[in-house]
């Protein structure tokens, strides 16, 4: 996947700095404070759907034979998400403010493609 | 994930019937010819994304919440994508033109939601 | 299950050197730091050095810094410890340790050793 | 480096006592701290973190508790398959990471 360099208007991935005080979160989170957890952005035109790697399934690479033929579902936008995401430890207070340890999958963006 | 009635704009899960014929993949997939594979439209507006059950992870919660507060990246749209697809059986010859079985993943769009 | 198997222990003279592999199975080997924790006979547990998941960082103990080197190879799931001008003292049970961490950038490690290998053992002795 | 002193270094008790082995930190460590269990011949078994949290599979008679520097894991009501040695290990700082001595719990 690309990374988001200034140069592309491209479906890429954006470094971000995720700090948990920012968003209030640090009251029940306790470690990491922040981390990098990235996002996607950019333009998905028709003939970055579906190629491999980029696209994130063969769904998507089915419906965008569909598209490219003009055929339904023709007017739905393809949209640039995260195709790769890694898990991160966290350290938090669960429901009953015990300290719990969990490796929580779908934290931080590592690639991102056109769905 | 809600489902396309004809009566919400929001992201839902459009049924559609995907004919392997008319995409011509037909010389290649013996089996299944068709099947509904589905798939997502509609829109996202703020606070459908990060919602349990429609965010696709934490790091959609996350980003949400940093949105809602005003704080980048409030310029990249909330996007209407499967979170959860499931598998099918497939035919197929393959590059040496031996006929395969495979369970194929990302088959078919079981629900959608804003990412 | 996960599981850890070392190597590479024996009997080898002061100013000797020994190579030590730890063989990881059942687990995404490159998310996790891995430590090597000694225990002489009859003696408690010493933290000797960690290397974390990417290989890019790797930390030691005062007695064995500048003697043993850590590092890993991700691609065949395996730790190693090389260990260089051994001295009497180094003699112990040696445990290769999977840390329970997953990090992320930047690097927040609260370390915690969830997974022992059975420990291999290293005499030094002239 | 943080010194951790666990005491005492050895103790007796007989099944069903209710057993408090402390760990002490040279300056303070929050709530970074974990207690293992070694059994002879065996390798040691991480039973605690964060000062108070169970790992998974671990009995409910354990419990730690502590913060700053004075840490303490307590066996409720002693089993025949705890008696074994105990280690502290600080969380805290970037490496050296440390132990206690170790406390070693015997069959009166």
């Known amino acids: 996947g690309l990374e988001c360099d200034g140069r592309t208007n491209l479906c890429c991935r954006q470094q971000f700095f995720i700090d948990f005080r920012l968003i209030g979160w640090n009251d029940w989170i306790i470690a990491p404070t922040s981390y990098y957890g990235n996002y996607c952005e950019g333009s998905c035109p028709a003939y970055l759907a579906g190629v491999p790697g980029s696209a994130s399934s063969f769904h998507t690479a089915v419906v965008n034979q569909y598209r490219m033929r003009g055929l339904n579902p023709g007017t739905v936008n393809s949209c640039c998400i995260p195709t790769k995401l890694s898990t991160m430890s966290m350290l938090y207070f669960d429901d009953e403010y015990n300290i719990v340890k969990r490796d929580v999958p779908n934290m931080i963006v590592e690639e991102c493609g056109c769905a | 994930g809600l489902e396309c009635d004809g009566r919400t704009n929001l992201c839902c899960r459009q049924q559609f019937f995907i004919d392997f014929r008319l995409i011509g993949w037909n010389d290649w997939i013996i089996a299944p010819t068709s099947y509904y594979g589905n798939y997502c439209e509609g829109s996202c507006p703020a606070y459908l994304a990060g919602v349990p059950g429609s965010a696709s992870s934490f790091h959609t919660a996350v980003v949400n919440q940093y949105r809602m507060r005003g704080l980048n990246p409030g310029t990249v749209n909330s996007c209407c994508i499967p979170t959860k697809l499931s598998t099918m059986s497939m035919l197929y010859f393959d590059d040496e033109y031996n006929i395969v079985k495979r369970d194929v993943p990302n088959m078919i769009v079981e629900e959608c939601g804003c990412a | 299950e996960v599981q850890l198997v070392e190597s590479g222990g024996g009997v080898v003279q002061p100013g000797g050197s020994l190579r030590l592999s730890c063989a990881a199975s059942?687990?995404?080997?490159?998310?996790?730091?891995m430590h090597w924790v000694r225990q002489a006979p009859g003696k408690g547990l010493e933290w000797v050095s960690l290397i974390t998941g990417d290989g890019g960082s790797t930390y030691y103990a005062d007695p064995v810094k500048g003697r043993f080197t850590i590092s890993r190879d991700n691609s065949k799931n395996s730790l190693y410890l090389q260990m260089n001008s051994l001295r009497t003292e180094d003699t112990a049970l040696y445990y290769c340790v999977k840390d329970w961490w997953i990090a992320a950038r930047p690097d927040y490690y609260y370390y915690g050793m969830d997974v022992w290998g059975q420990g291999t053992t290293v005499t030094v002795s002239s | 480096d943080i010194q951790m002193t666990q005491s005492p270094s050895s103790l007796s008790a007989s099944v069903g006592d209710r057993v408090t082995i402390t760990c002490r930190a040279s300056?303070?460590?929050?709530?970074?701290l974990n207690w293992y269990q070694q059994k002879p011949g065996k390798a040691p078994k991480l039973l605690i973190y964060?000062?108070?949290s169970l790992q998974s599979g671990v009995p409910s008679r354990f419990s730690g508790s502590g913060s700053g520097t004075d840490f303490t894991l307590t066996i409720s009501s002693l089993q025949p398959e705890d008696f074994a040695t105990y280690y502290c290990?600080?969380?805290?700082?970037?490496?050296?990471?440390?132990f206690g001595q170790g406390t070693r719990l015997e069959i009166k």
């Open positions: 290990q600080q969380s805290y700082s970037t490496p050296p990471i440390t």
């Open positions: 059942t687990f995404t080997f490159d998310d996790f730091a």
């Open positions: 300056q303070s460590i929050s709530s970074y």
């Open positions: 964060a000062a108070s």
